[in-house]
Amino acid sequence: DSSKWVFEHPETLYAWEGACVWIPCTYRALDGDLESFILFHNPEYNKNTSKFDGTRLYESTKDGKVPSEQKRVQFLGDKNKNCTLSIHPVHLNDSGQLGLRMESKTEKWMERIHLNVSERPFPPHIQLPPEIQESQEVTLTCLLNFSCYGYPIQLQWLLEGVPMRQAAVTSTSLTIKSVFTRSELKFSPQWSHHGKIVTCQLQDADGKFLSNDTVQLNVKHTPKLEIKVTPSDAIVREGDSVTMTCEVSSSNPEYTTVSWLKDGTSLKKQNTFTLNLREVTKDQSGKYCCQVSNDVGPGRSEEVFLQVQYAPEPSTVQILHSPAVEGSQVEFLCMSLANPLPTNYTWYHNGKEMQGRTEEKVHIPKILPWHAGTYSCVAENILGTGQRGPGAELDVQYPPKKVTTVIQNPMPIREGDTVTLSCNYNSSNPSVTRYEWKPHGAWEEPSLGVLKIQNVGWDNTTIACAACNSWCSWASPVALNVQYAPRDVRVRKIKPLSEIHSGNSVSLQCDFSSSHPKEVQFFWEKNGRLLGKESQLNFDSISPEDAGSYSCWVNNSIGQTASKAWTLEVLYAPRRLRVSMSPGDQVMEGKSATLTCESDANPPVSHYTWFDWNNQSLPYHSQKLRLEPVKVQHSGAYWCQGTNSVGKGRSPLSTLTVYYSPETIGRR
């Protein structure tokens, strides 16, 4: 309706004497801003005066004066949308209707709000879920239709008068829609909480009691049971009687059915609170409990372990493990049903009693072949001795024993011979099925356990065989001791380590990798000439003339072997330098003269330097110095210097004579 002012606020607000009331409020005027506001208590419209009568709790005046009452009542709104009010403290006689008289420049409006103030604090209200079951989490809610900024309060939860440990979540609402304080408590009730009193207590800021609400918990739970047994230790002998009684300590709702279970399985036709077992047998040993159900579900008692005692039954032997490997450990277990458990055991190996073995288990840490055979046992408890059952067979397996490799040939063996070997052993379990040989080669095995090596190599030093069943047993290697001529003969320079320079002390070594027999002789040769018969060839001061191709020979009683030819290279500084002149040392002016620096050097000369009779270097660095046309002034002594990576050498002086030509002489 466009002719109405629009207000939003809670319809009714609740408080108590001495507290306060906070009224959240919004509005929209028909036109323009608010010019006048009066808060009435129980306003009545006077038709005669066309005005409202009633107690004025608050009035906004144009001169700005505030009546004393306005200290208690505050208008917290504004001129266009907020009309929030606060009354602090609030009194019992404030109950009733509050009238908000609003006037704009052209329009007027009276808005009514209900205020309910009680004499003392009213109680909160506890809300419970429709059904509570044990161990299922529920939320308890405590709601109070009150909240005010000027009057802090708290809600506390109690169980049977004792504060609850669980943390509660408190929330407040002060909105135009609702005003309340709420506390929510999450709680997992147990069956023992059934019938207990829960209280929500309203307290002021100092924790002083103001009011409360209480509820009694109705916790649905399965029946809670206790079981009693006669005899109390539940240990009997075959033929005795046993009585078990089931008592219900709590059930909500009431129980409906009763049953008994043995080892988790229901016993037929046992639907009373007492279970009588007459003349029990050993099969009736087990775990018993009673089960009582209600609408929530079944409840079970604790289990009673009924033990029916009897003498040991015929025993069996379990072997861990058979067949057993020699050297491994084996455990024998005597298995015999008995109650109480057997206290003594007697063990037999191949029918003969094993002394000192009285335990349920026999442990042999290291099995040997003689441990094989049949094992049996007898068990004994306080009620008697059992019978010896069928025995268990232990099979002890072991690798082949005392394996040897035998050479069938006459000794010594020479490189290239045919060699036959056999592989022998003493005993084996299981039987030998194959043989292996080390090292592996492309060799013949003419029959099982025999090896034939055609054209035996110089390096066939040792051979070993293995006889194999599930395992291989290796014989000690046998030395073939193959005899051969010296091998891998080579010349090795041992001094100097780097390149050989003229004047160095040089040692060459005649190396070979192996020889059998070891006794050897050496021979050195250069260009077919015998030089020495030692393993080393030494030069105290090597000269360029010692360069050349060297070989060494090593021989033993089987044969002789030569090295590859080894080239000895001697590095030396330029030597034997001389200046040669072409066409000769006397040349006519105007012709061409070529001076050549001749030298002997290793490595070759890298560059030359030419000098004149004044020791002045000439700007020429090649081997030849060409003077063209030659002049009389070129006459004189020349010398050259050659340089390589080893060093330097220089020539003696050579004199060039340049004589005048007939033309020059004619002109004079």
Partner: antibody, heavy 122, light 107 residues
């Protein structure tokens, strides 16, 4: 009158590179009758020739075997100088380093630089 | 490498004395031998090259002789400025090598 002026750091860290320069005045690094050398002196090894560079139609180098794998001597014709680089130095390389001119035909060191004391710190 | 051995390692003499220092090469170095003088904190200074050629500004009291493997440096009449360390050096083979030095000290 030929003069040689050395420059470069006096302290080098272990395993780093020693670099020195020798500036020539009064002659050319490309001279056809001179060679340019580096020599060092230490109490333990005395005077030790390290190597040389020289020009005879092309550039040549000769190095001492003891440092051959670590040494480089380079001429710089644009600045008329030559340099020494010695890699992977150790405290054993601590010495006074000299540059020197060698002149044919006697091939002796007639002009020396002022010397640079180089310490290798570990 | 060519070994250069100087003897003696040190020599004590007075002003006006004649002093002889010898240098032996482990191999023939022809005439490629030089002699140097070094004073503390300074670079060596060339005295003689080619075994016997005196450098331009070196006083005539210094002389050198020898060829092949054995060489000699002679100072005919010692002057106060001659007290220093003297080194020989071969220049025939690479690497060039120096003697260990002879220290000339005032008696």
């Amino acid at each position: 009158q030929v003069q040689l002026q050395q420059s470069g750091p006096g302290l080098v860290k272990h395993s780093q590179t020693l670099s020195l320069t020798c500036a020539i005045s009064g002659d050319s690094v490309s001279s056809n009758s001179a060679a340019w050398n580096w020599i060092r002196q230490s109490p333990s090894r005395g005077l030790e020739w390290l190597g040389r560079t020289y020009y005879r139609s092309k550039w040549y180098n000769d190095y001492a075997v003891s440092v051959k794998s670590r040494i480089t001597i380079n001429p710089d014709t644009s600045k008329n100088q030559f340099s020494l680089q010695l890699n992977s130095v150790t405290p054993e390389d601590t010495a006074v380093y000299y540059c020197a001119q060698e002149v044919e035909p006697h091939d002796a060191f007639d002009i020396w630089g002022q010397g640079t004391m180089v310490t290798v710190s570990s | 490498d060519i070994q250069m051995t100087q003897s003696p390692s040190s020599v004590y003499a007075s002003v006006g004395d004649k002093v002889t220092i010898t240098c032996r090469a482990s191999q023939d170095v022809s005439g490629w031998l030089a002699w140097y003088q070094q004073k503390p904190g300074l670079a060596p200074q060339l005295l003689i090259s080619g075994a016997s050629t005196l450098q331009g500004e070196v006083p005539s009291r210094f002389s050198g002789s020898g060829s092949g493997t054995d060489f000699t440096l002679t100072i005919s009449s010692l002057q106060p400025e001659d007290f220093a360390t003297y080194y020989c050096q071969q220049a025939k083979y690479f690497p060039y090598t120096f003697g260990q030095g002879t220290k000339l000290e005032i008696k």
